[in-house]
């Protein structure tokens, strides 16, 4: 995500429009406590990070409260007073939505409607993945709102479901992150189950963004 400057690689994650995490990997400075300085306005003085992430006892990132912030993060990673990486980035391009909340299942014969609370901002896709013990891989369906109906299910089979949220690529670009998955929920004959008996540990989901 970050071009290298003096061998510094950066990663930015904007958690649900609330918190920004900037991490760095700087092999040249692996035993050095680099400092992180930032501002949200191009004309303000830099503030220093107050919430560092540590790796093997050295600074490796910063967590910033970015609620009510709506645009560009200007930042500088420094070795003492010497900047080793300076950049500005529109934060929205690194959005990671929060995991779906209040996931509910409504069954009607061979179909289920999966709903959850829509996030407060738009241009998102709500993806449901599901499989039965007889499926070799996860099936997927997504909608613009958290109201996804899956038809053609076999009422006698047990199905595992989980849900996540993704930012639409044509709006937010290719560098966003899907949310974490919701917990796996298992259903059979319209009733919740502890697990689908024949299913071992669920396989890795498809990594489609």
């Amino acid at each position: 995500q970050g071009g290298a400057a003096e061998g510094v690689q950066i990663q930015i994650i904007y958690f649900n429009l609330e918190t920004v995490q900037v991490t760095w990997n700087a092999s040249k400075y692996s035993r050095t406590n680099l400092t992180f300085h930032y501002r949200f306005n191009g004309d303000e003085a830099y503030d220093q990070c107050t919430n560092y992430l540590l790796q093997e006892g050295h600074t490796s990132g910063c967590l910033l409260d970015a609620e009510q912030r709506d645009d560009i993060l200007y930042f500088s990673i420094r070795n003492g007073t010497h900047p080793v990486f300076t950049a500005s980035r529109w934060m929205v391009y690194y959005l990671k939505p929060s995991s779906p909340k209040h996931v509910r299942f409504s069954w009607h014969q061979d179909a289920v409607t999966v709903t959850c609370s829509d996030l407060s901002y738009g241009d998102l896709l709500y993806e449901v993945q599901y499989r039965s013990p007889f499926d070799t891989e996860w099936q997927s369906k997504q909608e613009n709102t958290c109201n996804v109906t899956i038809e053609g299910l076999d009422a006698e089979k047990c199905y595992s479901f989980w849900v996540r949220v993704k930012a639409m690529e044509d709006v937010y670009g290719p560098d966003t992150y899907p949310s974490d998955w919701s917990e796996v929920t298992c259903w059979q004959r319209g009733e919740i189950r502890d697990a689908c008996a024949e299913t071992p540990t669920p396989p890795k989901p498809k990594l489609s963004k």
Epitope: Q1, G2, G3, A5, L17, G42, R69, D70, D71, I72, A87, S88, R89, W90, M91, V92, Y93, L95, S120, Y121, G122, D123, D170, V171, Y172, G173, P174, D175
Partner: antibody, heavy 125, light 106 residues
Framework: QVQLVQSGSELKKPGASVKVSCKAS????????ISWVRQAPGQGLEWMGW????????RYAQGFTGRFVFSLDTSVSTAYLQISSLKAEDTAVYYC??????????????????WGQGTLVTVSS | DIQMTQSPSSLSASVGDRVTITCRAS??????LAWYQQKPGKAPKLLIY???TRGSGVPSRFSGSGSGTDFTLTISSLQPEDFATYYC????????FGQGTKLEIK
Amino acid sequence: QVQLVQSGSELKKPGASVKVSCKASGYTFTSYGISWVRQAPGQGLEWMGWVNTNTGNPRYAQGFTGRFVFSLDTSVSTAYLQISSLKAEDTAVYYCAREGFIRTVVGAAGRFVYWGQGTLVTVSS
Amino acid sequence: DIQMTQSPSSLSASVGDRVTITCRASQDIHTRLAWYQQKPGKAPKLLIYWASTRGSGVPSRFSGSGSGTDFTLTISSLQPEDFATYYCQQYSAYPTFGQGTKLEIK
């Protein structure tokens, strides 16, 4: 359809002030941010900053703080650019441009699909 | 700032020609690049965003490519209405534009 209509050309003396307006129609004004872009005669395009039409929060690019003020009147779906203490080097066409894709609840992202027709501000004694 | 450098600064071509304009960013901007067309006395018009996605109503003869620091805008077969100035713009950081490429009739 989306339209941004700007106020007419202005001729001002050095030291004076000017206020350029940008009236939006064809969409919900508070849903998308408005940027201001400057183009000096025969020159390229320069982003001046943007204003969040939902919160009213202005953000100024480096070099456009102090004499430049972005404001809004959401009741008439209009954004304003005011420049005070005008100098000869402020002579330029000023454009308003609407954020293309990202809604104000999220912020902005610097892509401009819709533009006003431009307002020429000439500063001369 | 991220500097955007366009080349050439001007070029002459004929109707029907294939034309390529290049844009180089001073640092990696991934695919966060737009191309605009501007005619004299008019506002810029968005042609391409995400380096290769055509804007609404933009003819298919316009195409964009590139990623990282090097980008191109190609007009496959020039039409009379295509003679204008073209600007690239990065939106990875706060927006900056290239200096423009003036496309003139030969």
